[in-house]
């Protein structure tokens, strides 16, 4: 599931990783746009082994994955808030 949330919480990510995670091992992605108490965009990935990692939004692999997901979602769901299984 890919999720975009606007929250009033402060930053959720203490540490960010740019380590590649193949889509086959990703269960869910949550995007927290900057603002509302956090000065940066955050991307949280739930993996299929139940672990969770904050991903550096500048990591090339996550940017590519987000672009693919946006393209697949834009035809059927409103932007920027959408919820969808990793296709």
């Amino acid at each position: 599931v890919l999720e975009v949330y606007y929250t009033s919480l402060r930053c959720r990510c203490v540490q960010e990783s740019s380590v590649f995670i193949p889509r086959r091992f990703i269960d869910r992605i949550q995007i927290l746009p900057r603002g509302n108490g956090c000065p940066r965009k955050e991307i949280i990935v739930w993996k299929k082994n139940k672990s969770i990692v904050c991903v550096d939004p500048q990591a090339e692999w996550i940017q590519r994955m987000m672009e693919v997901l946006r393209k697949r979602s834009s035809s059927t769901l409103p932007v920027p808030v959408f919820k969808r299984k990793i296709p």
């Epitope: 380590v19 590649f20 889509r23 086959r24 090339e60 692999w61 990793i86």
Partner: antibody
């Protein structure tokens, strides 16, 4: 030349344990995720486990989760599979395989495989 | 879990024949399918990944196509060394292999 050599197979009783090893050479082992895949006699291929390049993440199908543990030692270019609570249905040739490139962004599957080691679970 | 239904399970053909094997996924796998060749007593060999991308050194008589849930693997002109068992693998959501297709000499 990429080489993967499995060892540690053999005959074990139901409920017993076994540790398989895979020695890797010909590539930068620490840059690649690695997997174990098995093949029961006369049957098809079945994925068993995958470990990330740094060893921090491991993934298993439900039928081996909690019984099998994949691990690696990048300093020794070695991959391991600890198998506990073995059952007759775990009897198979176990292959180690090179998986995705951990420093990249391409979703490539297992490309190079070893020749396998036979595990027989029988009383 | 994604299931991969591979057909046929066995196939007899002659040198020079065109051969097609299909794999049907239980859900959309977004072209994340690979094809392997395995000969008796040997390890599987990767031929194609991401539906149609040929591995380096693999002859062009091997090809793949498909999208969504339906995928095809084709050998355009069978050679004697092609008689083997072929497996599909989905790697969109964890891993699932097809049941295999044993390709035999007619």
């Amino acid at each position: 030349e990429v080489q993967l050599v499995e060892s540690g197979g053999g005959l074990v009783q139901p409920g017993g344990s076994l540790r398989l090893s895979c020695a890797a050479s010909g590539f930068t082992f620490s840059s690649y995720a690695m997997s174990w895949v098995r093949q029961a006699p006369g049957k098809g291929l079945e994925w068993v486990a995958t470990i990330s390049d740094g060893g921090s993440d491991a993934y298993y199908p439900d039928n081996v989760k909690g019984r099998f543990t994949i691990s690696r030692d990048n300093a020794k270019n070695s991959l391991y599979l600890q198998m506990n609570s073995l059952r007759a249905e775990d009897t198979a040739v176990y292959y180690c395989a090179r998986d995705y490139y951990g420093s990249g962004y391409e979703d490539s599957p297992m490309d190079y495989w070893g020749q396998g080691t036979l595990v027989t679970v029988s009383s | 879990d994604i299931q991969m239904t591979q057909s046929p399970s066995s196939l007899s053909a002659s040198v020079g024949d065109r051969v097609t094997i299909t794999c049907k996924a239980s859900q959309d796998i977004n072209k994340y399918i690979a094809w392997y060749q395995q000969k008796p007593g040997k390890a599987p060999k990767l031929l194609i990944h991401y539906t149609s991308t040929l591995q380096p050194g693999i002859p062009s008589r091997f090809s793949g196509s498909g999208s969504g849930t339906d995928y095809t693997f084709t050998i355009s002109s069978l050679q004697p060394e092609d008689f083997a068992t072929y497996y599909c693998l989905q790697y969109d959501n964890l891993y699932t292999f097809g049941g295999g297709t044993k390709l035999e000499i007619k």
